[in-house]
Every structure is written in C-alpha cells, then in structure tokens.
Amino acid sequence: EPPTACREKQYLINSQCCSLCQPGQKLVSDCTEFTETECLPCGESEFLDTWNRETHCHQHKYCDPNLGLRVQQKGTSETDTICTCEEGWHCTSEACESCVLHRSCSPGFGVKQIATGVSDTICEPCPVGFFSNVSSAFEKCHPWTSCETKDLVVQQAGTNKTDVVCGPQDRLR
C-alpha cells in the first residue's frame, strides 16, 4: 500500500517517499523504485539553507557598496551572505538591504548607546547635573563642572546644553 505520510527529511511523490536534498544541494530528479533522489551542489554564489526539494538554488545576497553595504560574512552553499554597513552607517532593517547615516544626538542630549552596523544611535536627554553642547554620535552627557572642588562658586547655573560657569568667591571685606 502506498504511503500517505513520510519520515522527516523525506517527501511524498508518485506514491513513494523520496529523500529531500541536503542543505547546499538542489533537486535534479525525484527518486524512483530503482534509484534515490538525485541532488546536485549549488553553484558558485548560490545557496540552499534547508533540507529541500528546490530545483533552483537561491542567489547569495549582494552587498551593494552604493547603498553603503559591505560583506560581514561570505555566503556558503548552505548559508546566505550577511551584509553590514560601512563605518558610520547602520542597516535600515533586519534584512540589512540598505544603510543610513548614524543619527547624532542634538545639544541637550547625549549618546546612551553608540550605533552599530545594525542599530542606530540611542540618545537620552541630559538629566539635571549633566549637559551636552554638541551634536554628536559618540558624546555622552557630561557632568557639570564642580565649582566647589576648585574652590570656586557658581556664577552661572548650568543647563542641559551648557556647563556651569564658575567664578572666584567674594572676599570678605
């Protein structure tokens, strides 16, 4: 009696169970009662990453330098190429199909997390006691200068964008 279901890594065709092709190989011909499934290796710049019955391998992803992309990991017959972005840029999606320039944190905001090839800069508002007076993709919020430790007094209060201004203490006459 012909099978109605097959084992793992097999498929049902013409009332018989045939082996799937292993990763890195494509299907050329189904098995017969005389011979096993015929599979052949994927060509240069092609891959298949699962047990399959595909008659064509997939093309490796192209990391287009015009889109700011570069190869992070070269593809094999069993894996796709992994792209990442050039220095100063990050992927616009998980698939990393294009890149955008890292965001800078405006004055009043500091870098909480520096951008990577796959994630953008994360900015945070400078809390009280900290400031940032530049637009930067690297600079954190800096603490206000401590006038007391310099034996000075605050002449002008700091903001989230400016440091405090210290000055000499008034001499007692």
Epitope: L27, V28, S29, D30, T35, E36
Partner: antibody, heavy 115, light 111 residues
C-alpha cells in the same frame, strides 16, 4: 516507472536544423531534469546539455552553445532538442535521459546529415 | 570540458574480475561524488549500473562495484559472465550544471 519515448529517425541536409522530441510518461514530468546525449557511429557518448522542465532552465555543453536549443511543453510532457547548422559530423544517435544521473533513457533517434 | 580518460579495452575470462579506471581532474571526478557508470550493449541505449560513485540501482547485481580515489574512479566487474561483454562509460558532474563522459571501454569476455 518513467518511460521516455523519442521521435523517429531523420535525414537532414547540411546547414539545416533538426528537432528531436522526447515524450515522458510515468512519474511527474516537472520533477526531473532531462539530459540530451549523442553518440556518433562507432564513437563514445557525448553530453549535450540539459533542461529542467519545472522552470524550463537550460544548461548546454560549451561545444554546442549557440547551436542547440532545448525546450519543453508541459501540457504534453515532452521535451525537445533542436540542433541547427547541421554538418555531416552531427550524424549520430541522439538520446534523451532522465536527470544528470541518466537512470532512464529514451530508445534513441538516428539523425543522418548528408547532402 | 575534456573527456574523462578510460582505457579503450579490457578483458577477462568468465568468473574472473576486471577493473576499469576513469581518470578526470580536481574539477570533476575529484571535486564531486557524482560519478556514474553505464553499460551499453551494441544497438541498445546505455544502462545505468552505478551512480553517486558506488551506489547500485535496484536490480543491478552486486558483481558490479565501484569506488573513487582522488581524481580517479574505478568500476570492478567480478565473476565475469558472457553477458557482461559490452561498452562501459563513466560520467562525472563537472560543476556549473555540466557533465562529462569518459571515452568508453570495450570489455571482452574471453573464451
């Protein structure tokens, strides 16, 4: 059990073209590639190329590139091999066979090129 | 692709063993485990007797065995019988959806 039945013998003039058919029965037509192989009288086997019926993609041996065309008609489960600009040295038996492995063969078609 | 190299002829007496070699390159026989062997009797289409280097299709007797070492594949026919007299061809996948045949070996069963 896959069976491949080929068209009959042909006599052709030099410079003309020949189109040989190979009809498949048994099995699923789109689930195997078909290779074409020729054998000149008293000579060995020569692989000409293959066609993948599921997508119609082809791959030809360098020697025949530009002169051979392989096509398929899924409605009749038939593949075709057309060889153009025939010369006397193309006189041979032309076989179709299943896959690259060639585990099933057609009966062969004799093509004679003579003026 | 140039043809794989086979000896033009081989012979043996009934009951003996005979081995036919098939030498290719590191781009075909040496690169892939996709070597096949075919038997062809005069006037007939070839018949697959070995595939994937050493596998036998169902119905092919185990007197036919094969192996591969480096760029050379070999077919051994043991317990030779009169009906084994035929032409034998090897083939190998050569990458990039290409296939190459050997020139063929005429096997004669003596006596």
């Amino acid at each position: 059990q896959v069976q491949l039945v080929q068209s009959g013998a042909e006599v052709k003039k030099p410079g003309s073209s020949v189109k040989v058919s190979c009809k498949a029965s048994g099995g699923t037509f789109s689930s195997y590639a078909v290779s074409w192989v020729r054998q000149a009288p008293g000579q060995g086997l020569e692989w000409m190329g293959m066609i993948n019926p599921s997508g119609g993609t082809t791959s030809y041996a360098q020697k025949f590139q530009g002169r051979v065309t392989m096509t398929r008609d899924t409605s009749t489960s038939t593949v075709y091999m057309e060889l153009s600009s025939l010369r006397p040295e193309d006189t041979a038996v032309y076989y179709c066979a299943r896959g690259f492995r060639m585990d099933q063969w057609g009966q062969g078609t004799l093509v004679t090129v003579s003026s | 692709q140039s043809a794989l190299t086979q000896p033009p002829s081989a012979s043996g007496s009934p009951g003996q063993s005979v081995t036919i070699s098939c030498t290719g390159t590191s781009s075909d026989v040496g690169a892939y485990n996709f070597v096949s062997w075919y038997q062809q009797h005069p006037g007939n289409a070839p018949k697959l007797i070995i595939y994937d280097v050493r596998k036998r299709p169902r119905g092919i007797p185990d007197r036919f065995s094969a192996s591969k070492s480096g760029n050379t594949a070999s077919l051994t026919v043991s317990g030779l019988q009169a009906d084994d007299e035929a032409d034998y061809y090897c083939s190998s996948y050569a990458g990039n959806n290409n296939l190459v045949f050997g020139g063929g070996t005429k096997l004669t069963v003596l006596g």
